[in-house]
């Protein structure tokens, strides 16, 4: 058992995992392909499921981070956070219950996820036992962005980060000392978790986000890959 920064003991018995309790990479569960009695997922259901899949991956990465360093209990976060320009939801983004605006919010979610991509790239090679998990989070986020872009009406309003700026930021982050790199890793995971939770709440306000279909065994469908787009 470990305790993360949020103080919660983690258990990875998420309801959309496979029977053997392994996190199933999106699109790799052959059991789902051969299940003709299931209803197809709506795009909103896929998005909801994809976010929960990524959040579960983040939870596993946080576990390793908190186990190998004391960053999760550190009080020096605010100091380090000031140097990172991590995306964050604000009232003006239209994603909260008050002042909710579907179009504005969707643009914010997509823009924020695009901005997180450089930080997710930074996370690669930052994990030992969870290397595959880090890659899965990164790839699943790319797929999520594609799903959301299909849902967005106002794609022109979405600003894509400048690749040169991102490359420069990545170099800068990788040049930090060990302590700062550990802190950066912790902060990225914490902020990304919060951003996804905020996004999930907002997306569940957007209409047809009903449950994921359940198969006869009672375990939820596990899929979502680029072939499903």
């Amino acid at each position: 058992d470990y305790k993360d920064h949020d103080g919660d003991y983690k258990d990875h018995d998420i309801d959309y995992k496979d029977d053997d309790d392994k996190l199933v990479p999106p699109g790799e569960d052959s059991k789902d392909v051969a299940a003709p009695h299931r209803q197809p997922l709506t795009s909103s259901e896929r998005i909801d499921k994809q976010i929960r899949y990524i959040l579960d991956g983040i939870s596993a990465l946080r576990k390793e981070t908190c186990n190998k360093s004391n960053m999760c209990e550190s009080s020096k976060e605010a100091l380090a956070e000031n140097n990172l320009n991590l995306p964050k939801m604000a009232e003006k983004d239209g994603c909260f219950q008050s002042g909710f605006n579907e179009e504005t919010c969707l643009v914010k979610i997509i823009t924020g996820l695009l901005e997180f991509e450089v930080y997710l790239e930074y996370l690669q090679n930052r994990f030992e036992s969870s290397e595959e998990q880090a890659r899965a989070v990164q790839m699943s986020t790319k797929v999520l962005i594609q799903f959301l872009q299909k849902k967005a009406k106002n794609l022109d309003a979405i600003t894509t980060p400048d690749p040169t700026t991102n490359a420069s930021l990545l170099t800068k982050l990788q040049a930090q000392n060990q302590w700062l790199q550990d802190m950066t890793t912790h902060l990225i995971l914490r902020s990304f978790k919060e951003f996804l939770q905020s996004s999930l709440r907002a997306l569940r306000q957007m209409g047809d986000l009903i449950s994921v279909p359940v198969d006869s065994r009672g375990s939820e469908q596990k899929l979502i890959s680029e072939e499903d787009l």
Partner: antibody, heavy 117, light 110 residues
Framework: QSVEESGGRLVTPGTPLTLTCTVS????????MSWVRQAPGKGLEWIGY?????STYYANWAKGRFTISKTSTTVDLKMTSLTTEDTATYFC???????????????WGPGTLVTVS | AYDMTQTPASVEVAMGGTVTIKCQAS??????LSWYQQKPGQPPKLLIY???TLASGVSSRFKGSGSGTEYTLTISGVECADAATYYC????????????FGGGTKVVVV
């Protein structure tokens, strides 16, 4: 970790009232918090959440009349236009959303009684 | 709106017996459901979360199950200390909600 409510008292209808939830050993930037009330002899009634991103969500019936806000160590519940129907014990509770959106309330205060008469 | 309907409102159970409490959501809540126990004069206590995961320190006599819109709390080998009111709570959606809690079930141990 502990949670304690204060500010409950006897008020007349129409009077505004603010309840305060004081937390100890809890980083409010890392936890969702909720206010729940319970009228005498009745069930639990959810009022609203304040999430780590500082967004607030309210029950349909509470919108406009109840406001939740927080500082680094307290979570306030501002109530306006109180009626006798608002007589209840008001609880503050700490939420845990360790993987997604499944807000469970794992630590509750003892409650503070508000009587509108 | 997401509404939670809990049944029965009250149930009597003999010591050592089994009691089953049901909770139905008006829309699917994707297993994001918790159960609480409340005794008179006390705040509620978290028993089960995410449908079936026992909260820290809770007896394995308490078992949660369900999916979609239908959820169940089963208490086996009932003891005197289990006499309380039990509430379900959905954690799936906090928008367009009248109450995230079910109406409660009073368990009387005879």
């Amino acid at each position: 970790q502990s949670v304690e409510e204060s500010g409950g008292r006897l008020v007349t209808p129409g009077t505004p009232l603010t309840l305060t939830c004081t937390v100890s050993g809890i980083d409010l930037s890392s936890y969702d918090m909720s206010w729940v009330r319970q009228a005498p002899g009745k069930g639990l009634e959810w009022i609203g959440y304040i999430y780590t991103d500082s967004s607030t969500y309210y029950a349909n019936w509470a919108k406009g009349r109840f406001t939740i806000s927080k500082t680094s160590t307290t979570v306030d519940l501002k109530m306006t236009s109180l009626t006798t129907e608002d007589t209840a014990t008001y609880f503050c509770a700490k939420g845990s959303t360790d993987y997604a959106f499944d807000t469970r309330l794992d630590l509750w205060g003892p409650g503070t009684l508000v009587t509108v008469s | 709106a997401y509404d939670m309907t809990q049944t029965p409102a009250s149930v009597e159970v003999a010591m050592g017996g089994t009691v089953t409490i049901k909770c139905q959501a008006s829309q699917s809540i994707s297993n994001e459901l918790s159960w609480y126990q409340q005794k008179p004069g006390q705040p509620p206590k978290l028993l089960i979360y995410r449908t079936s995961t026992l909260a820290s320190g809770v007896s394995s006599r308490f078992k949660g199950s369900g999916s979609g819109t239908e959820y169940t709390l089963t208490i086996s080998g009932v003891e005197c200390a289990d006499a309380a009111t039990y509430y379900c709570q959905q954690g799936y959606n906090s928008n367009d909600v009248d109450n995230v809690f079910g109406g409660g079930t009073k368990v009387v141990v005879v």
